[in-house]
C-alpha cells in the first residue's frame, strides 16, 4: 500500500494506490483511491507513467480529457466515471502489454488540495493449470497443463502422502512458445503416480503462483486449482 500526500501542508489530500500485476493480452486495473470531494467538477485525475512523455489518462470536469494522452495508451484507458465522486480514481487498462510495466503516478486535485501516490505495475502472463490423468502413457502418469505464462515459470510437483519428496527425477517439464511469440504453454508430466493420493502441480514466476491439485482414487478423480498474484503491495 502506498499512501501519498500533497506537498503543500494543509492543502494536501491522501491518495492510496496498490501495486498490481497485469496479464498480457487481457484487461487490467490500476488501483487508486483518494479523499472524495462533493463536486465532481472540482476533481482532476491524472495518471502518468515514468518514462512516458504524454499522459496515460486525464479526467476532469466530469469527463475524460485525452488531448495530452500518449499514443501508446490511445483507446485503451478509462476511469470508473460514476465512482470518481466517491474517491475511486482507478484506471481500466485494455489489452495489457509487456511494455505497460513500470511506475505509474496517480495524481489528484480536488477543492481540498492535491495529492499523489506511485504504483508499481508488473506485467506478464499467468493462467490456471489443469491436471489430468494421462491415459496414453505406459505407466500411471499425470499431465499438468497451463496455456499462458511469462516470464518462464518454475514447476514443482508435490504429494500429500510423500510430503517433502523431490519429484524432479520423475517429472518432465516443457515450455512451448505460443503463436504471439511472448507467452508460453507449460506442460509438466509426473510419472509413477500412485492412487489414493493427492498430487499438486505448482507453477510460479515473479508475478503469480498457481496450483493444480488432483486426487486419484479407484472410484473417482477430483480436481481443484487456484491462482494467486504475488507482490500486491499498497502505497
Amino acid at each position: 500500500l502506498i499512501i501519498g500526500f500533497g506537498i503543500s501542508g494543509r492543502h494536501s489530500i491522501t491518495v492510496t494506490t496498490v501495486a498490481s500485476a497485469g496479464n498480457i493480452g487481457e484487461d487490467g486495473i490500476l488501483s487508486c483511491t483518494f479523499e472524495p470531494d462533493i463536486k465532481l467538477s472540482d476533481i482532476v485525475i491524472q495518471w502518468l507513467k515514468e518514462g512516458v512523455l504524454g499522459l496515460v489518462h486525464e479526467f476532469k470536469e466530469g469527463k475524460d480529457e485525452l488531448s495530452e494522452q500518449d499514443e501508446m495508451f490511445r483507446g485503451r484507458t478509462a476511469v470508473f466515471a460514476d465512482q470518481v465522486i466517491v474517491g475511486n480514481a482507478s484506471l481500466r487498462l485494455k489489452n495489457v502489454q509487456l511494455t505497460d510495466a513500470g511506475t505509474y503516478k496517480c495524481y489528484i486535485i480536488t477543492s481540498k488540495g492535491k495529492g499523489n501516490a506511485n504504483l508499481e505495475y508488473k506485467t506478464g502472463a499467468f493462467s490456471m493449470p489443469e491436471v489430468n490423468v494421462d491415459y496414453n502413457a505406459s505407466s500411471e502418469t499425470l499431465r499438468c497443463e497451463a496455456p499462458r505464462w511469462f516470464p518462464q515459470p518454475t514447476v514443482v510437483w508435490a504429494s500429500q502422502v510423500d510430503q517433502g519428496a523431490n519429484f524432479s527425477e520423475v517429472s518432465n517439464t516443457s515450455f512451448e512458445l505460443n503463436s504471439e511469440n511472448v507467452t508460453m504453454k507449460v506442460v509438466s508430466v509426473l510419472y509413477n503416480v500412485t492412487i489414493n493420493n493427492t498430487y499438486s502441480c505448482m507453477i510460479e514466476n515473479d508475478i503469480a503462483k498457481a496450483t493444480g491439485d488432483i486426487k486419484v482414487t479407484e472410484s473417482e478423480i477430483k480436481r481443484r486449482s487456484h491462482l494467486q498474484l504475488l507482490n500486491s503491495k499498497a502505497s
Epitope: 487481457e26 484487461d27 494522452q69 483507446g75 478509462a78 489489452n95 504471439e180
Partner: antibody
Amino acid sequence: QLQLQESGPGLVKPSETLSLTCTVSGGSIKSGSYYWGWIRQPPGKGLEWIGNIYYSGSTYYNPSLRSRVTISVDTSKNQFSLKLSSVTAADTAVYYCAREGSYPNQFDPWGQGTLVTVSS
Amino acid sequence: EIVMTQSPATLSVSPGERATLSCRASQSVSSNLAWYQQKPGQAPRLLIYGASTRATGIPARFSGSGSGTEFTLTISSLQSEDFAVYYCQQYHSFPFTFGGGTKVEIK
C-alpha cells in the same frame, strides 16, 4: 440527441481524392470521452474501420489504408472530415461516420451513410 | 490484425423463436466486443458492448455472452423488426475489425 450527417460527392474518378465531411449536431465534438471515426461498407459486403480522430487532432488509421487516408477535425464547425487519395473501384462503398467511445470503443451513434462510387 | 468470423452466414428462424449467433476471434479479445444490427438501407445500430452490456434502449430479448475468442448473441424471441444482418466487432486492438455478418431471415 446526438446526430451525425455525412456529406460529399457521390461520384469520384479513379486516381482522384475522395472527400467527405461529417457534421455533428446535438452535442459537441469536443466532448472528451469520444473519438470520431469513419467506417465503410462496399455494396453487399461487410464493414471496414478506416480510422478515428480526437477533437485535439490526434489520429489513428487502419494500417491497410494509412498511406492514403487523412482525417481532420474542425471544432469551430463541429465537423470532421475524411480524405482518401488515389481511389480505385475497390473504394466504392457506403461511407459512415460515427462516434467512437474512448474505451470501451463501440460505435454509437452512426450517420446514415453516403454512397461513394468510383468510376470514370 | 484480429480476424472475426461469424456463423452461420444465414440463419432462418420463425417469429417467436430463439436465434443464436456466433462470433469467433482469431485471438483473445477479452470482453472487448460489440454487436450491431443493420437493416437494408440503414446504418448499423449498436446492440451490445463489453460482450454482454446492452446499449441504451435495446430490448431485453437481446443478450450477449462470451469472452476470449468465443462470443454469442442471443435473441430470445424474434420479433418481425429483428430480421436483419448482425455484425460483431472487436475493439481489443487496432485496427478494429468486424465479422462478416450473419443474416437472420424469416423461415
